[in-house]
Amino acid sequence: EEELQVIQPDKSVLVAAGETATLRCTATSLIPVGPIQWFRGAGPGRELIYNQKEGHFPRVTTVSDLTKRNNMDFSIRISNITPADAGTYYCVKFRKGSPDDVEFKSGAGTELSVRAKPS
């Protein structure tokens, strides 16, 4: 079995303010078991946008049903985009751990740019 890769096919996405952004992410393997998380930015100051395992993220929905067998699509939609949402978003695969899951592999990132609403 080849090692899992996290694929973010879009280097950049442009969305108008007030619209919904779709950030695409797929994994290439079911192994290792563990959740996906999305972050804005990289490094220790990165901001958690979505965590499959736990948390409440009212503006975020997953494109696919994550409970369905063989699912490897971890794309998300972020609603009601504002200029403050601009940045680079990373889809990160975690490996099941004890007691805590461990970061395994990150996608290359997708830069979200926000176009102001025409006045």
Partner: antibody, heavy 119, light 110 residues
């Protein structure tokens, strides 16, 4: 930390019903399947059924299809397994288990609930 | 339905020796590039614990003396050097279709 806390031991008469509960914590309840498995005294493991709390999709072992019902209460992150028309050979420890990878496997287990059926 | 048959039903192995448990499926459990076999360890009075998923992948925290192998219909759980704490009943499970378990193999120390 994922935890599955099951209800206490039950003693039932033949022909009665039992409803075992499994309260989940440490993860988003609607993102992962819950399985139910039983083990008669000194015997092996027997899969009963599974439920997706996000949409209540269920799959049953044909042996239990007419007597078992799985439900969930997403407001309390609790799964339930009701077994009807109890017989003495239903005496067993009943386990709930969470499937962390949507692989139809059992990653995290409750401690079990002993159901004794005796006249 | 796919039936899993484990062998042997019980075995006794000396400390430090290799223990091998087999699981045979009545038809192939391979699908979508994966072998849908899982191994569990159950100690007395405890719930089962997942050891191996998708035939050969160790679960989190499982010592590397445990390994899984096989493809299609024949699978093996190997403990390379038996420790006292490995005394337990071991079960295989498939999920090629709806899950079923093997009958279990009781592992004891010789």
């Amino acid at each position: 930390q994922v935890q599955l806390v099951q209800s206490g031991a039950e003693v039932k008469k033949p022909g009665a019903s039992v409803k075992v509960s499994c309260k989940a914590s440490g993860y988003t309840f609607t993102n992962y399947w819950i399985n139910w498995v039983r083990q008669a005294p000194g015997q092996g493991l027997e899969w009963i059924a599974m439920i997706d709390p996000s949409d209540s999709e269920t799959h049953y072992n044909q042996i239990f299809k007419d007597r078992a019902t799985l439900t969930t209460d997403t407001s309390t992150s609790t799964a339930y397994m009701e077994l009807r028309s109890l017989r003495s050979d239903d005496t067993a420890v009943y386990y709930c288990a969470m499937d962390y990878g949507s692989l139809y496997a059992m990653d995290y287990w409750g401690r079990g609930t002993l159901v004794t059926v005796s006249s | 339905d796919i039936v899993l048959t484990q062998s042997p039903d019980s075995l006794a192995v000396s400390l430090g020796e290799r223990a091998t448990i087999n699981c045979r499926a009545s038809q192939s459990v391979r699908s979508s590039g994966y072998n849908w076999i899982f191994w569990y360890q159950q100690k007395p009075g405890q719930p089962p614990k997942l050891l191996i998923y998708l035939a050969s992948n160790r679960d989190s925290g499982v010592p590397d003396r445990f390994s899984g192998s096989g493809s299609g219909t024949d699978f093996t759980l190997t403990i390379s050097s038996l420790q006292a704490e490995d005394v337990a009943v071991y079960y295989c499970q498939h999920s090629r279709e709806l899950p079923t378990f093997g009958q279990g193999t009781k592992l004891e120390i010789k």
